[in-house]
């Protein structure tokens, strides 16, 4: 294993005129650790403010975690010659707040990208597609990890965060080959209609620990390869017939529904019937009612139709506060 020589500057990496030169095939950037045998470069927890320009051409796995990158511009990893071997890129926890269009262009082998734990106030619609064409060249990405990328409220720039992420996922239909998508812990209240239809190859989808309140227009019908669907720790009250039928129609899927505030009233009857006969829900015996109060902590599988009633709504004049 080689690491940056002691004569290298200890300041965060800054591009210089020399960076226009092609990198030596085996050199290691300042503040990074490199292993040619493992095809791995780690520039971890070094407060880097830019992506090193002199990355070795052999790099297959690049860890740039725990830095202070702030902005990822177009062509942030574009090199001459290109980093043709780079397959896994981890940028988690690097204080990124802006990922611009074309940030990952000229990485022909990039299979896995992790942007988790960055407060992305701006994610360009063309971050993953690279161009604003209605149909872009397919992205090589197979795994895209976007857990906890929601910015604090004061950085949201008055736009829908759900919409911003969805736009990047569907732009140019570039991510049709994506197998894994993690979107956990992003405060999502909804998914824009048809976003999943643009990701037909998905095998693993993690939407856990969000605030999803309805799946009425989330269509899983096209996701015929889906194997794992994580919906734990959301705000789901009930799943309706259309959703139940779509999930049942997926040949390989396992669905995780724990820790949602299920409302056990008359609207829940179809879901309870479905739960009793389906094999797709993992840990279905753990699902319990949250509302109404009289049903709290009752196990959904143990309910029958007589338990699931809707109290008549009193006219306002008869209601008490």
């Amino acid at each position: 294993t080689s690491s940056a020589s002691s004569s290298s500057s200890s300041a965060p990496f800054l591009a210089s005129a020399a960076s226009a030169q092609p990198p030596l095939p085996d050199q290691c950037p300042a503040l990074c650790e490199c292993s040619e045998a493992a095809r791995t470069v780690k520039c971890v927890n070094r407060n880097l403010t830019e992506v090193p320009t002199d990355l070795p051409l052999y790099v297959r796995n690049l860890f740039l975690t725990g830095n202070q990158l702030a902005v990822l511009p177009a062509g942030a990893f574009a090199r001459r010659p290109p980093l043709a071997e780079l397959a896994a890129l981890n940028l988690s926890g690097s204080r990124l707040d802006e990922v611009r269009g074309g940030a990952f262009e000229h990485l022909p082998s990039l299979r896995q990208l992790d942007l988790s734990h960055n407060p992305l106030a701006y994610l360009s619609p063309f971050a993953f597609s690279g161009s604003n064409a209605s149909i872009s060249a397919p992205s090589p990405l197979v795994e895209l990890i976007l857990n906890h990328i929601v910015p604090p409220d004061d950085k949201r720039q008055n736009r829908s965060f759900e919409g911003m992420v969805a736009a990047a996922l569907v732009a140019g239909r570039a991510l049709q080959g994506l197998h894994l998508l993690e979107l956990a812990s992003n405060h999502f209240l909804y998914l824009p209609r048809d976003v999943l239809a643009q990701l037909p190859s998905l095998r693993y989808l993690d939407l856990s620990n969000n605030s999803l309140v309805s799946l009425t227009y989330v269509s899983f019908r096209n996701l015929t390869h889906l194997e794992s669907l994580h919906l734990e720790d959301n705000a789901l009250k009930v799943l309706h017939n259309g959703t139940l039928a779509e999930l049942q129609g997926l040949p390989h899927v396992r669905v995780f529904l724990d820790n949602n505030p299920w409302v056990c009233d008359c609207h829940m009857a179809d879901m309870v019937t479905w739960l009793k006969q389906t094999g797709v829900v993992q840990g279905k015996d753990r699902l319990t009612c949250a509302f109404p109060e009289k049903m709290r902590n009752r196990v959904l599988l143990e309910l029958n139709s007589a338990d699931l009633d809707c109290d008549p709504i009193l006219p306002p004049s008869l209601q008490t506060s």
Epitope: P125, S160, A166, Y190, L191, P192, R193, T216, V218, H240
Partner: antibody, heavy 118, light 107 residues
Framework: QVQLQQSGPELVKPGASVKISCKAS????????VNWVKQSHGKSLEWIGD????????NYNQKFKGKATLTVDMSSSTAYMELRSLTSEDSAVYYC???????????WGQGTSVTVSS | SIVLTQTPKFLLVSAGDRVPITCKAS??????VAWYQQKPGQSPKLLIY???NPYTGVPDRFTGSGYGTDFTFTITTVQAEDLAVYFC?????????FGGGTKLEMK
């Protein structure tokens, strides 16, 4: 910022057709459905239908099937609604609206007034 | 199609009032209800979606609640600029339908 710019007012004769445009800017056009809504003078809102700009797929209110045709031009990020066989009942303001949360419309055009009169 | 019955049609209010508007669906629409505000000569503006979630930038005096068939939209402290027509909309099944509207006017 997100904007939906609709074409100007139309005065047309009964039996004629009219095509209203809605040019979108400030967002990824193909990522969101475009809805069309009718508002007759002093009345409520009526949903005409929606179109998925990504593939041109449409969903119409049965009441407007045969009356309205929705199309998009992805290259110009523009949605269109054609109304045909117009009668005085079709006199109204027509809005295009971008969908945000499914079904809900978070940005609206300024409206296009269509007056059918001989 | 699902019918939404919105009441009342008109409301005379004073600044500072708490104003509830109700919307009743002819069948269950789960929590798939949106509320809009339309000021004279303007396009509608989305205030609430999924029954209770305020849209980005909407003042917190506008709130929504309900599930199934019965929904309430409330302005907790009416201000002069809130004078408008308010519409509910169900987005549960096509065709999406709107309530008849509630017009807010100052006493």
């Amino acid at each position: 910022q997100v904007q939906l710019q609709q074409s100007g007012p139309e005065l047309v004769k009964p039996g004629a057709s009219v095509k209203i445009s809605c040019k979108a800017s400030g967002y990824t056009f193909t990522a969101y459905y475009v809805n069309w809504v009718k508002q007759s003078h002093g009345k409520s809102l009526e949903w005409i239908g929606d179109i998925n700009p990504n593939n041109g797929g449409t969903n119409y209110n049965q009441k407007f099937k045969g009356k309205a045709t929705l199309t998009v031009d992805m290259s110009s990020s523009t949605a269109y609604m054609e109304l045909r066989s117009l009668t005085s009942e079709d006199s109204a303001v027509y809005y295009c609206a971008k969908e945000g949360p499914p079904g809900a419309m978070d940005y609206w055009g300024q409206g296009t007034s269509v007056t059918v009169s001989s | 199609s699902i019918v939404l019955t919105q009441t009342p049609k008109f409301l005379l209010v004073s600044a500072g009032d708490r104003v509830p508007i109700t919307c009743k669906a002819s069948q269950s629409v789960s929590n798939n209800v949106a509320w809009y505000q339309q000021k004279p000569g303007q396009s509608p503006k989305l205030l609430i979606y999924y029954a209770s979630n305020p849209y980005t930038g909407v003042p917190d005096r506008f709130t929504g609640s309900g599930y199934g068939t019965d929904f309430t939209f409330t302005i907790t402290t009416v201000q002069a600029e809130d004078l408008a027509v308010y519409f509910c909309q169900q987005v549960y099944s096509s065709p999406f339908t709107f309530g008849g509207g509630t017009k807010l006017e100052m006493k």
